[in-house]
């Protein structure tokens, strides 16, 4: 039994880091493998992660981390029984994938303005809480070409757009994702999408 693709890990910088790897053949990850992880810090103790299958030869493990700070560094040991298959390390702050924003809501009752709001996925005491920026994706269910991205570079989790920038009388969907420049993170997953019917009053033409 050998590791074909070494584990790569990403952290949500709150409580979970996810490590994925591939073995050289079909593997029952949960029964055959264990990933041990330990914070490099005095008196820290090793924790065991039981991996799950992720495709025939792929494995994934969710490492629980109660608290993360930028200097944290973990040792990782991948075991098959008594055999050490791979040894490495992981610094969560250098491999951050933020949590996806939630509770995306479209408010359509504000005088021909669409107000999109969502929730910051981090609690206020987490470092990322004040460092997230967002991308909002809006698209038409009827017209695949009607697809747009709005970059929200301020901290407030909201976006206002004129309803007239979208077509009237048709349904749109929106979703939002987050990233943090400070840690050069990857983008989060998209939030679940929300749907609304776009309608607004055309301005009267003056003759």
């Amino acid at each position: 039994m050998k590791v074909l693709q070494e584990p790569t890990c990403v952290s949500d910088y709150m409580s979970i880091s996810t490590c994925e790897w591939k073995m050289n053949g079909p593997t029952n990850c949960s029964t055959e493998l264990r990933l041990l992880y330990q914070l490099v810090f005095l008196l820290s103790e090793a924790h065991t992660c039981i991996p799950e299958n992720n495709g025939g030869a792929g494995c994934v493990c969710h490492l629980l981390m109660d608290d993360v700070v930028s200097a944290d560094n973990y040792t990782l040991d991948l075991w098959a029984g008594q055999q050490l298959l791979w040894k490495g390390s992981f610094k969560p702050s250098e491999h951050v994938k933020p949590r996806a924003p939630g509770n995306l809501t479209v408010h359509t009752n504000v005088s021909d303005t669409l107000l999109l709001t969502w929730s910051n996925p981090y609690p206020p005491d987490n470092y990322l809480y004040n460092h997230l920026t967002y991308a909002v994706n809006i698209w038409s269910e009827n017209d695949p070409a009607d697809f747009r991205i709005y970059n929200v570079t301020y901290l407030e989790p909201s976006l206002r757009i004129a309803a007239s920038t979208l077509k009237s009388g048709i349904s749109y969907r929106a979703r939002v994702r987050a990233w943090a420049q400070c840690y050069n993170t990857t983008w989060s997953e998209w939030s679940p999408s929300t749907k609304w019917h776009n309608s607004y009053r055309e301005p009267f033409e003056q003759h």
Epitope: S44, D66, A71
Partner: antibody
């Protein structure tokens, strides 16, 4: 909110015993090493003892080794310091601190006075 | 045991001044160093960890540098609330040890 609350301090005679407690809340207690630090009146900080999250490893300052015992009850989210053969120089405010990584959290301390 | 020597033991400064406190370890501790601020009657508050990382919520006027045996805490522009005692602490090995403290007083 993460909180540590020490109790058990008081006045004790030289040679006497005292047990300090530290009640933890707002975090997964068993995941963190914990520590006791003390500060004599008008003096600096002195580390006293530390214990791993499971309680399996303990360390002590030379000044208290053999007299003090650190322990924890993870089911009660509580850290303890049993202090025996107390001396006048043990008089101090005793702080408990969460020590599991760099994000140290301290309690407000409990005063131990050793005097006849 | 690793000895931590802090200097100066006290410093008089005015609001707006730049203040530098040094801490020397008796042997190499890599970056395993923390800096604390303590005000009378209060528990110590973590300012800097891992020698140079700013603890969340701590103002950016505080900064830490150094590695090995020599470390520095700098307050770039002293504010009224910064008058306090500052301690360094090594986290490289047991027993954990603190510096003797630096009291920052109003000039």
């Amino acid at each position: 909110e993460v909180q540590l609350l020490e109790s058990g301090g008081g006045l004790v005679q030289p040679g006497g015993s005292l047990r300090l407690s530290c009640a933890a809340s707002g975090f997964t207690f068993s995941s963190y090493a914990m520590s006791w630090v003390r500060q004599a009146p008008g003096k600096g900080l002195e580390w006293v003892s530390a214990i791993s999250g499971s309680g399996g490893s303990t360390y002590y300052a030379d000044s208290v080794k053999g007299r003090f015992t650190i322990s924890r009850d993870n089911s009660k989210n509580t850290l303890y310091l049993q202090m025996n053969s107390l001396r006048a120089e043990d008089t101090a405010i005793y702080y408990c601190a969460r020590y599991g990584n760099w994000n140290y959290i301290w309690g407000q301390g409990t005063l131990v006075t050793v005097s006849s | 045991d690793i000895q931590m020597t802090q200097s100066p033991s006290s410093v008089s400064a005015s609001v707006g001044d730049r203040v530098t406190i040094t801490c020397r370890a008796s042997q190499g501790i890599s970056s395993w160093l923390a800096w604390y601020q303590q005000k009378p009657g209060k528990a110590p508050k973590l300012l800097i960890y891992a020698a140079s990382s700013l603890q969340s919520g701590v103002p950016s006027r505080f900064s830490g540098s150094g590695s090995g045996t020599d470390f520095t805490l700098t307050i770039s522009s002293l504010q009224p609330e910064d008058f306090a005692t500052y301690y360094c602490q090594q986290a490289n090995s047991f027993p954990l040890t603190f510096g003797g403290g630096t009291k920052v007083e109003i000039k």
